[in-house]
């Protein structure tokens, strides 16, 4: 592989220049097709970018291209104008040429960006030479926004720059006006002004009136050294164009419009925020608007102009507050299509948007936020927060006005005090417990939608990670064993690496939870329990005495236990064990281990069917002597003896 061509590219400032075969020309001894001569950009340009003419010029920087694409003029270098002026800048591209099986060739393409170059698309050699617009018979300041030779100064090393200036020598004066520096006219005897005077805003063009023909001046600009000495350096001879406008030649410029917002059936004035133009050569009364198309949600009216709709009005009507929009009962937004003219220029299209606000909004809270206990956090959804008015409000915004006590609201995993409906719908708003001392929390938000607000309280509860028995009824008067078949927090234990604890908050209404002795030899009867652990459940140390509802005929009943479940590093949770009870039926297989059965049933105890269906021996053989209130092992013996 060999590389020919100058490997230098000269680019005009701010322009796009194609790479050509003069710049970059690869060939191979095998006469390889240019499509197969591949360049890879190892290091891209610093002062601009390389892109392909056929591809999206805003896309990613070019990484690969072929010699064929260079030949076709499709590989372009674009120089990006920096904020600071310069005279000449240099850029480099490091390329690697490859075409297997030949060895790769490294190449450097040097790019020179210079104001020295003759540039058809940028005829001026100055940083700015934009010309000036001036109203007929008036004066206008020529500032560095229009004429600026700072780039000539940029050719001087920065330490010496402050001692230099640029001298503009007027070689042809304006024919229809005059130039003034610090209010002193320039003339053949004093034809100079400086870049520093231009930068200080001291150069003025005064038009002499008598027509709107073009004007301008020619000048030569070159560097001037300390104490006015002439120095070698860049210079240029150019013309500065001055366009003289008729006093009412400038067309009105429409300004950005804010939508009018009002509630259904109401009336609102239209102000300059909705309709305004900039037109220095027209009075507000001369700027006329005409309604081309009106929306269905109301009409425009003029104060003092009758009650009906108006189709023509002026900027003066707007400025004085006489123009109003009258909304009908519709809740849909609408747009007025208007045309606007100052009478001298062609009409310009404009629009006025009208947004009908809800008279009230409602924050719908369909369900409290349930936080899984082992996770300690949960995403909010439309179930928790959704705003409706006369329609759904997908663009509602929320602000926290009373934060949660035991946690934080987060967006993107970061604490926040404001969020949007959109973020809720994406699952991005998360409530996380940070203080594990409560099983519930709440926070208050202010919802804002289309200018109307409403507040709401979101309740947060923790969903216990607990497997609860959900089988058939339990026998009244019996004591059944509470074990992991009834209550099991084993998964919570695994997830937290701790032994979960239970606290009895409420219930049962008929009966009680007791700790049963380990063996017959253990002294004491069963003890009332208010707290226990998962280990207690696994050890079979707990019993539930199922009572009979008092003062009513025997029959099925319902009861429940309310428990608070605690574990390390997670919030506590309240859980309920709901169960049905029925009079004891010795013939019925109960799906829990019974530690004792009702006294009256014990006459049947010797019969085979008195064994519990779980394969546990009946109470005569297995009960660890619970001293239950209504009948126990001793009273069972006593009853049998006397019978």
């Amino acid at each position: 592989l060999s590389l020919k061509g100058s490997q230098t590219l000269t680019v005009c400032p701010g322009s796009v220049q194609p790479l050509s075969s003069q710049t970059l020309r690869a060939s191979s001894s095998a006469g390889t097709d240019p499509q197969l001569l591949l360049y890879r950009v190892v290091r891209g340009p610093q002062l601009g970018r390389l892109f392909h003419a056929q591809q999206d010029s805003t896309g990613e920087a070019l990484v690969n291209f072929t010699q064929a694409e260079v030949y076709a003029g499709n590989i372009l270098y674009e120089h990006e104008m920096p904020p600071e002026p310069f005279w000449e800048a240099h850029d480099t591209l490091e390329l690697q040429l490859s075409s297997p099986p030949a060895r790769d060739v490294a190449a450097t393409l040097a790019v020179a960006v210079s104001f020295e170059a003759a540039c058809p698309q940028h005829p001026s050699h100055l940083w700015k030479n934009k010309g000036l617009w001036v109203p007929e018979g008036q004066r206008a300041r020529i500032t560095v926004a229009a004429l600026d030779a700072s780039n000539l100064l940029a050719s001087v090393p920065s330490p010496q720059r402050s001692e230099h200036d640029v001298l503009f020598q007027v070689t042809q004066f304006p024919s229809r006006g005059q130039l003034l520096v610090s209010e002193e006219p320039l003339h053949a005897g004093q034809p100079h002004f400086l870049q520093s005077q231009l930068a200080a805003g001291q150069l003025v063009y005064a038009h002499g009136g008598g027509g709107t023909q073009q004007d301008g001046f020619h000048f030569r600009a070159h560097l001037q050294g300390p104490a006015g000495a002439s120095v070698a350096g860049p210079q240029t001879s150019e013309a500065f164009a001055i366009t003289v406008r008729d006093v009412n030649e400038r067309p009105p410029q429409p300004q950005a419009s804010v939508p009018l917002r009002l509630t259904r059936g109401s009336r609102a004035p239209i102000s300059r925020a909705q309709l305004s133009v900039v037109d220095p050569d027209s009075a507000p009364g001369e700027i006329e608007y005409e309604v081309q198309r009106a929306p269905h949600n109301g009409f425009l009216s003029l104060v003092g102009g009758g009650l009906g709709p108006v189709t023509r009005f002026t900027q003066a009507d707007v400025d004085s507050g006489r123009l109003a929009f009258v909304a009908n009962g519709s809740s849909v937004a609408g747009i007025f299509q208007l045309s606007m003219s100052d009478g001298a220029s062609p009409p310009l299209p404009m629009s006025l948007a009208v947004d009908i606000l809800p008279s009230a909004i409602e924050v719908q809270l369909r369900a409290p936020l349930e936080v899984p206990q082992a996770l300690g956090r949960s995403s909010l959804s439309q179930q928790q927060l959704r705003v409706v008015s006369d329609r759904e409000e997908p663009e509602a915004a929320y602000r926290l006005i009373q934060g949660p006590q035991y946690g934080h609201l987060l967006v993107g995993g970061r604490p926040t005090s404001a969020f949007s409906q959109f973020q809720i719908d994406q699952g991005e708003v998360v409530f996380a417990f940070t203080n594990f001392s409560s099983s519930h929390d709440h926070f208050r938000v202010l919802a804002l939608a289309r200018g109307v607000n409403a507040s709401a309280v979101v309740n947060v509860t923790v969903r216990a990670l607990l497997h609860v028995w959900a089988g058939g009824p339990w026998p009244q008067g019996a004591t059944l064993r509470l074990d992991p078949t009834v209550l099991d927090a084993g998964e919570l234990a695994n997830r937290t690496g701790s032994v979960p604890r239970f606290r009895l908050l409420e219930g049962p209404r008929h009966g009680r939870v007791v700790r049963v002795p380990r063996a017959r030899t253990e002294p004491g009867g069963s003890q009332l329990v208010e707290q226990f652990t998962q280990q207690d459940l696994e050890d079979g140390r707990l019993g539930l005495e199922v009572g009979r509802p008092e003062g009513r005929a025997p029959g099925p009943a319902g009861d429940s236990l309310t428990l608070e479940l605690w574990a390390q590093g997670v919030p506590p949770a309240v859980a309920s064990l709901d169960f049905a009870t029925e009079p004891y039926n010795a013939a019925r297989p109960y799906s829990v281990a019974l530690l004792s059965v009702p006294e009256a049933a014990r006459t049947e105890a010797g019969k085979p069917e008195s064994s519990t269906p779980t394969g546990e021996p009946g109470p005569m053989a297995s009960s660890p002597e619970p001293a239950v209130a209504k009948g126990g092992f001793l009273s069972f013996l006593e009853a049998n003896m006397f019978s």
């Epitope: 993107g412 995993g413 970061r414 973020q423 994406q426 699952g427 991005e428 998360v430």
Partner: antibody, heavy 112, light 107 residues
């Protein structure tokens, strides 16, 4: 402090599926909020691929959605990225991150 | 998608200089913005989250400000270890998007 470590093949053939795993140590993946995959093409900026959340929800960058799957294995404290039908344009350094902490990145080259 | 545009794309500065990098979002993102630092061959490191909150272990010479669409990262006194590329990232809307980066080089 949480540490993340990417693992997986450094070379994948075009049209095949890129598979990477991120192992989280010093914390549980049910403790973080968003477990992300991000990639960086050579010499370029960062592109978010997608995430899996603490509660197992996914969100993916629409530009890659049809080809991406992010899953997790809580028992191994890992989450994974699968990117199907890869092309040379998928050559990049792939990072796993929870945004507070990032893995050191793994370069995946797609080439035949 | 929300486009994030950083400026400048690169800058040269000296140790001790005050450096400011700006990031502009194509639409409002409230304060949902993070800043990262990345050194060659390394993973990005979180510097600032939620526009102005300093991540743990990050020196106090780094600060962030802004809201809506315009955001700024400031390094009050540039240190030798601060020469790196800096990225902003929004997390207001999915997909989460990054700026194209600002390279801070030694003058």
């Amino acid at each position: 402090q949480v540490q993340l470590q990417e693992s997986g093949p450094g070379l994948v053939k075009p049209s095949q599926t890129l598979s990477l795993t991120c192992t989280v140590s010093g914390g549980s993946i049910t403790d973080g909020y968003y477990w992300n995959w991000i990639r960086q093409h050579p010499g370029k900026g960062l592109e978010w691929i997608g995430y899996i959340t603490f509660d197992g929800r996914n969100n993916y960058n629409p530009s890659l959605k049809s080809r991406v799957t992010i899953s997790r294995d809580t028992s191994k404290n890992q989450f994974s990225l699968k990117l199907s039908s890869v092309t040379a344009a998928d050559t990049a350094v792939y990072y796993c991150a929870d945004f507070d902490y990032w893995g050191q990145g793994t370069l995946v080259t797609v080439s035949s | 998608d929300i486009q994030m545009t950083q400026s400048p794309s690169s800058l040269s500065a000296s140790v001790g200089d005050r450096v400011t990098i700006t990031c502009r979002a194509s639409r409002g993102i409230r304060e949902y913005l993070n800043w990262y630092q990345q050194k060659p061959g390394k993973a990005p490191k979180l510097l600032i989250y939620y526009t102005g909150s300093l991540h743990s272990g990050v020196p106090s010479r780094f600060s962030g400000s802004g809201s809506g669409t315009d955001f700024t990262l400031t390094i009050s006194s540039l240190q030798p270890e601060d020469f790196a590329t800096y990225y902003c990232q929004q997390y207001s809307e999915l997909p989460w998007t990054f700026g194209q980066g600002t390279k801070v080089e030694i003058k």
